[in-house]
């Protein structure tokens, strides 16, 4: 059964900036990846992110940069400074679709003890 | 404007073979997943085949598990489903129908469909 | 496999009343969930996708909404090309599923 995983960074160097790493471990062909926050995208959450392998990268504030790291995961910088800006115990969720199995999520947030700089 | 048109269906005798052709055109066929979906006289929607848009990746139910193959040719723009064995149980309607990555793969284009009757 | 129930299976309705249509699915879906019309002779339609989602061109009166497992359509005044078979579709997993479709017919 493909999986999903998911990292949540706090940058070391901006306190308030975080970077979201999420991968698909699994034999199909990655299709879309949609990264929200607050919950799964068809759970209440906000989409941060839309990430497709041919048609390219949509994100809305606060995202500043998503890319793809290899075919099958990607990441997520966020932007530290603002009213919509992410606090220490936000969920992050990351779905990818795949075809024809169809799609798998996971969601993390920033571990309470974590220091900055250290993966969750 | 997307059209897909449906060709290839007819009658046919329990045991026999058809091979039905769907033309793509006014959009990149290439970069679309791609799907078969027949309605059975007085039933329900069915989604009997699909295909990755690489060709890489297929999809069947069960019930044509081993009797149909799904294919394209992404240089002609054309999609194909190869049915052998056919049984009584297979006489529908057949579309060709075109799967949308951000719409989570709901179908956005169908063809008018081709007839497929299996009767001695 | 996910099997998606819809009800009821028919509806006698007037023109100009207000319609929902209900759709459950066997285990969640998340928001992987269209809803599709189709009339005799025609290929199906999309409407919505993504739940609520309005495909282009489909008029405002129709409109999606639901989470997880339970999903309805709702058309606000049924126009008289409004009557025909309407199926919910979830292409979450493998094996994508349709429901047995709700047909809408005059009264």
């Known amino acids: 059964t493909p999986e999903v995983w998911v990292q949540v960074r706090m940058e070391a160097t901006e306190l308030s900036s975080f970077t979201i790493r999420c991968g698909f471990l699994g034999s199909g062909s990655i299709s879309l990846v949609t990264v929200s926050w607050g919950g799964p995208n068809g759970a209440g959450g906000t989409t941060l992110a839309v990430l497709h392998p041919e048609r390219g990268i949509r994100q809305w504030a606060p995202a500043r940069q998503a890319r793809w790291e290899t075919q099958s995961s990607i990441s997520l910088i966020l932007e530290g400074s603002g009213a919509s800006s992410p606090c220490a115990n936000t969920t992050f969720c990351c779905k990818f679709a795949s075809f024809p199995e169809g799609s798998w999520e996971a969601c993390g947030s920033l571990p309470p003890s974590s220091d900055p700089g250290l993966s969750a | 404007e997307v059209q897909l048109v449906e060709s290839g269906g007819g009658l046919v005798q329990p045991g026999g073979s058809l091979r039905l052709s769907c033309a793509a055109s006014g959009f990149t066929f290439s970069s679309y997943h791609m799907s078969w979906v027949r309605q059975a006289p007085g039933k329900g929607l069915e989604l009997v085949a699909a295909?990755?848009?690489?060709?890489?990746?297929?999809y069947y139910p069960d019930t044509v598990k081993g009797r149909f193959t799904i294919s394209r040719d992404n240089a002609k723009n054309s999609l194909y489903l190869q049915m052998n064995s056919l049984r009584a149980e297979d006489t529908a309607v057949y579309y060709c129908?075109?799967?949308?990555?951000?719409?989570?793969?709901?179908?956005?284009?169908w063809g008018q469909g081709t007839l497929v009757t299996v009767s001695s | 496999e996910i099997v998606m129930t819809q009800s009821p299976p028919t509806l006698s309705l007037s023109p100009g009343e207000r319609v929902t249509l209900s759709c459950k699915a066997s285990?969640?879906?998340?928001?992987?969930v269209a809803w599709y019309q189709e009339k005799p002779g025609q290929a199906p339609r999309l409407l919505i996708y993504y739940v609520s989602h309005r495909f282009t061109g489909i008029p405002a009166r129709f409109s999606g909404s639901g989470s997880g497992t339970d999903f309805t359509l709702t058309i606000s005044s049924l126009q008289p090309e409004d009557f025909a078979v309407y199926y919910c579709h979830q292409a979450y997993r493998s094996p994508w599923t349709f429901g047995q479709g709700t047909k809408l017919e005059i009264k």
């Open positions: 285990q969640s879906v998340s928001n992987d």
């Open positions: 295909i990755s848009r690489d060709g890489d990746s297929t």
């Open positions: 129908s075109r799967h949308e990555d951000y719409f989570g793969f709901a179908m956005d284009s």
